[in-house]
Amino acid sequence: APVRSLNCTLRDSQQKSLVMSGPYELKALHLQGQDMEQQVVFSMSFVQGEESNDKIPVALGLKEKNLYLSCVLKDDKPTLQLESVDPKNYPKKKMEKRFVFNKIEINNKLEFESAQFPNWYISTSQAENMPVFLGGTKGGQDITDFTMQFVSS
């Protein structure tokens, strides 16, 4: 069966939107009005992995682009990147672990934990116009809570 996907945008708990920053990076900043069109639309695919009531494994692709968020070691540090894939083969139910995030819902907020690197989360900073990254702390000054807005196909 084909993998189930939905289109959505994400905003951090400070209401910053996610936009492209160069070809292989996302950044977070406050957008309003027509600028909202800049925000990236994700194709969130529900993939194979360890699942529970509040934890669902997903892959985060960029809609109509052959780019997926992935987690890899760079200079011995877990790092978030946008990785180019062959669109003929993706998305798929059994995604490589670096593409998988545990979508965790807590109090109507979402966290995205790397399946490859447990306790590392998709993060933004308090500052405006700075990259989205993989952070190793929750509840500190970095932001790990997001809300999801559904986008019609």
């Epitope: 900073s125 116009n129 990254f133 970095d142």
Partner: antibody, heavy 118, light 107 residues
Framework: EVQLLESGGGLVQPGGSLRLSCAAS????????MFWVRQAPGKGLEWVSV????????RYADSVKGRFTISRDNSKNTLYLQMNSLRAEDTAVYYC???????????WGQGTLVTVSS | DIQMTQSPSSVSASVGDRLTIICRAS??????LAWYQQTPGNAPKLLIH???SLQSGVPSRFSGSGSGTDFTLTINSLQPEDFATYYC?????????FGGGTKVEIK
């Protein structure tokens, strides 16, 4: 008053290492992104590296990637730049700078000179 | 990487002149542009951020304009202390990049 004071520069042979420090005062260091920017003698400005307040996010210019490492100790209000495998073209004044709104450098240190020569 | 091109690279002017420096980005950077002033032997000083916002403490004779790829720094009525080198810098994406600088000399 915001103050940034670099130290650790000097003369080093090609292939050698140096660690630069930047002592920050007059603001809540742990809340700010920080940059290293360099300027070769008689040349323009070149951005080198950035680090987030928590230290989890770092980025580097292609010219230093794999050789330089940015880090910080928020308990000591200090920013660092570990420079390995130094080359003659790394000769420059190295500035640390506090990152202001959206990615500008709103306060700069006075700079420390790194000379790579045999 | 985004290339930043400044013009002119140098200019001679007199006290009281109105001066315009142009900065062009190789791609759209929205309004994520800063301008700096550097005098010999000193660190750069932030003048303008977000293309048009005057940094606190900077005299109002300095102004910035533009968005997208084309930006200008204008100095109305040059003062003796304004003879320096000016740099633009894009903050749209990493790696951050600077223009090559514009040296403003006394005519």
């Amino acid at each position: 008053e915001v103050q940034l004071l670099e130290s650790g520069g000097g003369l080093v042979q090609p292939g050698g290492s140096l660690r630069l420090s930047c002592a920050a005062s007059g603001f809540t260091f742990s809340k700010y992104f920080m940059f290293w920017v360099r300027q070769a003698p008689g040349k323009g400005l070149e951005w080198v590296s950035v680090i987030s307040p928590s230290g989890w996010m770092t980025r580097y210019a292609d010219s230093v990637k794999g050789r330089f490492t940015i880090s910080r100790d928020n308990s000591k209000n200090t920013l660092y730049l570990q420079m390995n495998s130094l080359r003659a073209e790394d000769t420059a004044v190295y500035y640390c700078a506090r990152v202001g709104y959206g990615g500008n450098s709103d306060y700069w240190g006075q700079g420390t000179l790194v000379t790579v020569s045999s | 990487d985004i290339q930043m091109t400044q013009s002119p690279s140098s200019v001679s002017a007199s006290v009281g002149d109105r001066l315009t420096i142009i900065c062009r980005a190789s791609q759209d950077i929205n309004r994520w542009l800063a301008w700096y002033q550097q005098t010999p032997g000193n660190a750069p000083k932030l003048l303008i951020h977000s293309a048009t916002s005057l940094q606190s403490g900077v005299p109002s004779r300095f102004s910035g304009s533009g968005s997208g790829t084309d930006f200008t720094l204008t100095i109305n009525s040059l003062q003796p202390e304004d003879f320096a080198t000016y740099y633009c810098q894009q903050a749209d994406s990493f790696p951050l990049t600077f223009g090559g600088g514009t040296k403003v000399e006394i005519k």
